[in-house]
């Protein structure tokens, strides 16, 4: 049975030509965490394995950078990274949890960070 | 099996810079984050920042900005720290360390710095 | 930036003897890592995500908490378990250490 939970940093906006954070935490579970995935919407942005450490994909390699932790910074942001950011972890024995993150892209000064939330 | 191997203690003045080297084997240096600990005896461990070897990011904690300088040089797997404008204040024990996403799992052996006036 | 506060600062415990330190945060974190650290040499990764044992640590060790209060824990007391233990947060930046325990055997 599926124990865990992913706790996000939920919907964030930030400036454009600015960075951001996003993490992910999975709780509630003893399993060991092999590998996590981060993708946006259908594309591949970085996998951190838990033998062979990071690996960002080629077309992110100036601007993603790994950490803190399991999490991920984007750099000089524009307004085409606006949208859907997904953690998948991968874990033994439960399987796979995925949370997911919503990033808004702004013109303005006018950034703020969304509450913390949980996907069970 | 991974390993960080520090350069050897420096007497520096007061005022000087001070370049210590971090050399990496036994894993892929570009695939981890490698970050760099001050130790004193007084003030214990105190995170200074880390590169990314992959593409050189850098992030550094604000108090050591301007201060400390990480760089990486991928042909010799190789980190670097400068240190400029020593002052006593900067007389301690500095570590390497690599980091995966799962806490600092390998340290090297620090590299021991005194500043004299 | 997180503080993280320590305590007790330095201890001592007979072998055999549970023993519990603690690590309290200045605002929430999401995990914890521990550090083990013996004079005259580097630190060394001990737990890692709250509650994981690093490779070659003995099972008699544990770790647990969240949000704010964490905790490592020996269940008996052995003599090659004397040393300085550090906690370390890397939830927010900068990543912070704490000021560390120092136990010592009875």
């Known amino acids: 049975m599926m124990t865990g939970t992913i706790e996000t940093t939920g919907n964030i906006s930030a400036e454009k030509g600015g960075s951001i954070i996003l993490q992910c935490h999975l709780s509630s579970t003893t399993a060991q965490v092999t590998q996590v995935n981060w993708e946006q919407q259908d594309q591949l942005l970085a996998i951190c394995n838990a033998d062979l450490g990071w690996h960002i994909s080629p077309s992110f390699k100036d601007r993603v950078a790994p950490g803190p932790g399991l999490g991920l910074t984007l750099q000089s942001l524009t307004v085409n990274d606006t949208g859907e950011y997904f953690c998948i972890y991968h874990t033994y024995p439960d399987g796979t949890y995925t949370g997911r993150i919503f990033l808004e892209v702004l013109e303005s000064s006018v950034a703020e960070h969304g509450a913390r939330f949980q996907i069970p | 099996q991974a390993y960080l191997q520090q350069s050897g203690a420096e007497l520096v003045r007061s005022g000087a810079s001070v370049k210590m080297s971090c050399k990496a084997s036994g894993y892929t240096f570009t695939s981890y984050n490698l970050h760099w600990i001050k130790q004193t005896p007084g003030q214990g461990l105190k995170w200074i920042g880390y590169?990314?070897?992959?593409?050189?990011?850098?992030n550094y904690n604000q108090k050591f900005k301007g201060k400390a300088t990480l760089t990486a040089d991928t042909s010799s797997s190789t980190a670097y720290m400068q240190i400029n404008s020593l002052t006593s204040e900067d007389s301690a024990v500095y570590f390497c360390a690599r980091e995966g996403g799962w806490a600092m799992d390998y340290w090297g052996q620090g590299t021991s710095v005194t500043v004299s006036s | 930036q997180i503080v993280l506060t320590q305590s007790p600062v330095i201890m001592s415990a007979s072998p055999g003897e549970k023993v519990t330190m603690t690590c309290s945060a200045t605002s929430s974190v999401s995990s914890m890592h521990w550090y083990q650290q013996k004079s005259g040499t580097s630190p060394k990764r001990w737990i890692y995500d709250t509650s994981k044992l690093a490779s070659g640590v003995p099972i008699r060790f544990s770790g647990s908490g969240s949000g704010t209060s964490y905790s490592l824990t020996i269940s008996s007391m052995e003599a090659e378990d004397a040393a300085t233990y550090y906690c370390q947060q890397w939830s927010s930046n900068p990543s912070t250490f704490g000021a560390g325990t120092k136990l010592e055997l009875k």
């Open positions: 590169i990314y070897p992959g593409n050189g990011y850098t």
